[in-house]
């Protein structure tokens, strides 16, 4: 019996087609992805093949103005239109709190939404009961397939699930659910979830009875053969894991941002064992037509976005200096504003010992592309912020050793004075440079704000200590020459859309007046 699994993950609000790098589509003839194009390909495959499941492994939420404005209603609407069969909860599905998940998505989705390792307690337990499930048995042709969900247990540190959801260890939570499916005579089981490729592989290895793992969170690109675009494969598609009980378990993921549609063909024997598996992600490039009816619907929903981007988010009573002349040479107040917003967006008081789990922010000055003049009645709009942060990036959470941070700050000024983008703006960090010293030895003082303290204060950076830092995904991926971050990071979790982080902060503060306050000094 053959099953075709079509899968997406980490779509992050890319409802419209995007450029090849998943930013805003500029030249339509070269654009990719988007739900209208995805629908065309899904329909083609459904037409051609008999047993097809369309699955999403989480993080539909967060990433573009679509989510900022529609807050998840757009996800439910278009996933319903594409007739998804199931979705796993990702960490970003909790970005607007549990209410922001329940109302727009859980109550509106016409497909099951899954996670076996999230347990509700207190008053939430009855409110959310039945709105998401640990597993679902789906009829496919003449057979049944069990889908069991899982979500990163780090979600409380990455999003806003509140205090009434407990995120259990994935493997511990999955095993009893899979066992239950087996007692229900379901012998074909897919684990669908959002914990990253390493955990996907562990689930394939450790959870008895799981036949296939469809994952997300780590934006992993797998491919067999010559890859069709810029993404470099982390391994073959599917990635085969030998389970502890000796089975060959295919593990798949389909990069991110709706650029690819994962396509996995599985052949099962009559006892539900995987006989063979093959496939590849399908690049949704511009040669695949956008479905006109979905496209028309997108255009209808788009109208509200255009109106939103010119509305006032808040006011500034000072000039927001985002000029290259400032932000690539010294501390600039736009850099301070953005870093403050980044930290504010990551306030998660999850432990009595820590005032917060993260206190530090770094931001490449070259990523700040425009100032905002306060003389326009102080008004700040989404449009203004899009000029400051035009690249559609995210502000991510990483874990780095102190020694890596020291290298990053040396890199920040290794060729100082040439208006290059690697000069770092900061938050929760005090740095002093001596430019008379040779490159690689210019950081004379580097103090960082403590987290394990009731009264935050600045302490010298410890080389062997592991620190959490918020930074642009661009830096996490080694951009602007920060190869040491990419090579040495110990953990990387993708965060919220950059503009969204800053706009939320400005809306919350109502009036802002960031200063230059001595975060960066030259001796």
């Amino acid at each position: 019996w053959e099953l075709t699994i079509l899968h997406t993950n980490d779509v992050h609000s890319r409802l419209e087609q995007t450029s090849e790098d998943s930013s805003k589509c500029v030249n339509a003839s070269r654009c990719m992805g988007g739900v209208a194009r995805l629908f065309t390909k899904v329909q083609q495959i459904r037409r051609a093949e008999p047993n097809v499941l369309l699955l999403d492994a989480g993080d539909q939420y967060q990433g573009t103005i679509w989510f900022t404005v529609y807050k998840g209603a757009e996800v439910a609407h278009f996933m319903n239109a594409l007739r998804y069969d199931a979705m796993a909860l990702g960490n970003h599905e909790f970005d607007n709190g549990v209410e922001g998940l329940i109302e727009p998505l859980l109550k509106e989705a016409k497909f099951p939404i899954l996670s076996a390792n999230i347990k509700a307690k207190g008053p939430l337990a009855s409110q959310i009961s039945g709105l998401y499930l640990p597993y679902k048995v789906l009829p496919v042709g003449d057979e049944v397939v069990g889908i069991v969900g899982y979500t990163s247990k780090e979600t409380p540190f990455l999003s806003n699930p509140g205090t009434n959801l407990v995120f259990e260890d994935e493997i511990t939570a999955l095993q009893p659910e899979v066992d239950k499916l087996k007692t229900l005579n379901v012998n074909k089981i897919i684990a669908l979830g959002h914990s990253g490729f390493e955990m996907d592989k562990l689930i394939a290895q450790k959870v008895r009875g799981v036949d296939v793992v469809v994952g997300g969170h780590s934006n992993t690109f797998l491919y067999t053969g010559n890859p069709p675009s810029k993404e470099v494969p982390a391994g073959k598609y599917p990635f085969i894991v030998t389970s502890d009980d000796g089975r060959k378990v295919p593990v798949v993921q389909a990069y991110a941002f709706g650029k690819y549609l994962g396509y996995l063909k599985i052949e099962f024997d009559e006892r539900g064992n995987v006989i063979s598996s093959h496939g590849n992600p399908i690049l949704l490039n511009s040669s695949i037509p956008e479905d006109p009816s979905i496209k028309a619907d997108i255009n209808k929903w788009r109208i509200k976005l255009d109106n939103y981007s010119t509305q006032e988010l808040g006011k500034t009573i000072v000039y927001l200096d985002g000029s290259s002349q400032s932000c690539r040479f010294r501390e600039c107040n736009m850099g301070n504003l953005i870093c403050d917003a980044m930290i504010n967006n990551n306030l998660r008081h999850t432990d009595e010992m820590f005032w917060n789990h993260v206190s530090m922010c770094i931001l490449n000055g070259g990523g700040i592309r425009s100032p905002i003049d306060e003389r326009n009645n102080g008004t700040i709009t989404w449009e203004n912020l899009a000029a400051v942060l035009p690249f559609g990036g995210t502000f991510d959470l990483v874990q780095l050793k102190g020694s890596t941070l020291k290298k990053a700050f040396e890199h920040s000024v290794h060729r100082y004075g040439q208006s290059t983008g690697e000069f770092l703006q900061v938050g929760g960090i005090h740095v002093v440079y001596d430019l008379s010293r040779k490159p690689g030895d210019r950081v004379v003082k580097l103090d960082v704000l403590c987290t394990k303290c009731r009264v935050p204060s600045y302490d010298p950076l410890k080389m062997d200590e592991v620190y959490k830092v918020i930074l642009p995904n661009f830096l996490a991926n080694g951009g602007d020459g920060f190869q040491m971050i990419k090579d040495e990071l110990l953990r990387h979790d993708s965060g919220d859309q950059d503009i969204n982080v800053v706009s939320t902060y400005i809306s919350k503060m109502k009036v802002i007046y960031p200063a230059v306050e001595g975060r960066i000094k030259f001796s």
Epitope: R47, P50, I282, S287, P289, P292
Partner: antibody, heavy 121, light 107 residues
Framework: EVQLVQSGAEVKKPGESLKISCKGS????????LSWVRQMPGKGLEWMGE????????YYNEKFKGQVTISADKSISTAYLQWSSLKASDTAMYYC??????????????WGAGTTVTVSS | DIQMTQSPSSLSASVGDRVTITCKAS??????VAWYQQKPGKAPKLLLY???YRYSGVPSRFSGSGSGTDYTLTISSLQPEDFATYYC?????????FGGGTKLEIK
């Protein structure tokens, strides 16, 4: 090398049955769609219908529904077009053509050389 | 069914000429348009797919454009081997329909 090899020319009488074939080679037969296209003498191209050999799913142009049957035998990588009762108006060249539904080329990328069917009393 | 109206039905041109053939769909076919070349006694050959993508091995003098309902095939500089019949086809909805063809002859 991808090839679609069609069976030879046929001369038939009205009312007779006929089954012509198209054998695929050089590619995974079950991963592509196969269409049949008619071209009457001196005329243009008409899509008759298609089969997806992997699933056996068939789709017909309403104009040809009930007139012809499209089938495939994936064990020998061959698709068929058959008539149970031929008419003189079935006289035409019949092409099979491949369609890559998993790829991004919206069109028939490989064609057979064609089978000439002549129906005459 | 979607009608594909191709024009002109025949065309005389000389080697080196620039030639344009148009195809109008009776409804939006969202760039799912292919163009074929057919020579007498031969099977059609795919030239362009998805309105503007040249199929592998097709010379760069062949180009396509269009969206919605209007599509164009352009041959920038006619070569002797280009004299043939050209067909457009919509691959958006079944039944997949072809244009009536354009016979390109030597002037």
């Amino acid at each position: 090398e991808v090839q679609l090899v069609q069976s030879g020319a046929e001369v038939k009488k009205p009312g007779e049955s006929l089954k012509i074939s198209c054998k695929g080679s050089g590619y995974t037969f079950t991963s592509y769609g196969l269409s049949w296209v008619r071209q009457m003498p001196g005329k243009g191209l008409e899509w008759m219908g298609e089969i997806y050999p992997g699933s056996g799913n068939t789709y017909y142009n309403e104009k040809f529904k009930g007139q012809v049957t499209i089938s495939a035998d994936k064990s020998i990588s061959t698709a068929y077009l058959q008539w149970s009762s031929l008419k003189a108006s079935d006289t035409a060249m019949y092409y099979c053509a491949r369609y890559d539904y998993l790829g991004s080329s919206y069109g028939f990328d490989y064609w057979g050389a064609g089978t000439t069917v002549t129906v005459s009393s | 069914d979607i009608q594909m109206t191709q024009s002109p039905s025949s065309l005389s041109a000389s080697v080196g000429d620039r030639v344009t053939i148009t195809c109008k769909a009776s409804q939006d076919v969202s760039t799912a348009v292919a163009w074929y070349q057919q020579k007498p006694g031969k099977a059609p050959k795919l030239l362009l797919y998805s309105a503007s993508y040249r199929y592998s091995g097709v010379p760069s003098r062949f180009s396509g454009s269009g969206s919605g309902t209007d599509y164009t095939l352009t041959i920038s500089s006619l070569q002797p081997e280009d004299f043939a019949t050209y067909y457009c086809q919509q691959h958006y909805n079944t039944p997949y329909t072809f244009g009536g063809g354009t016979k390109l002859e030597i002037k």
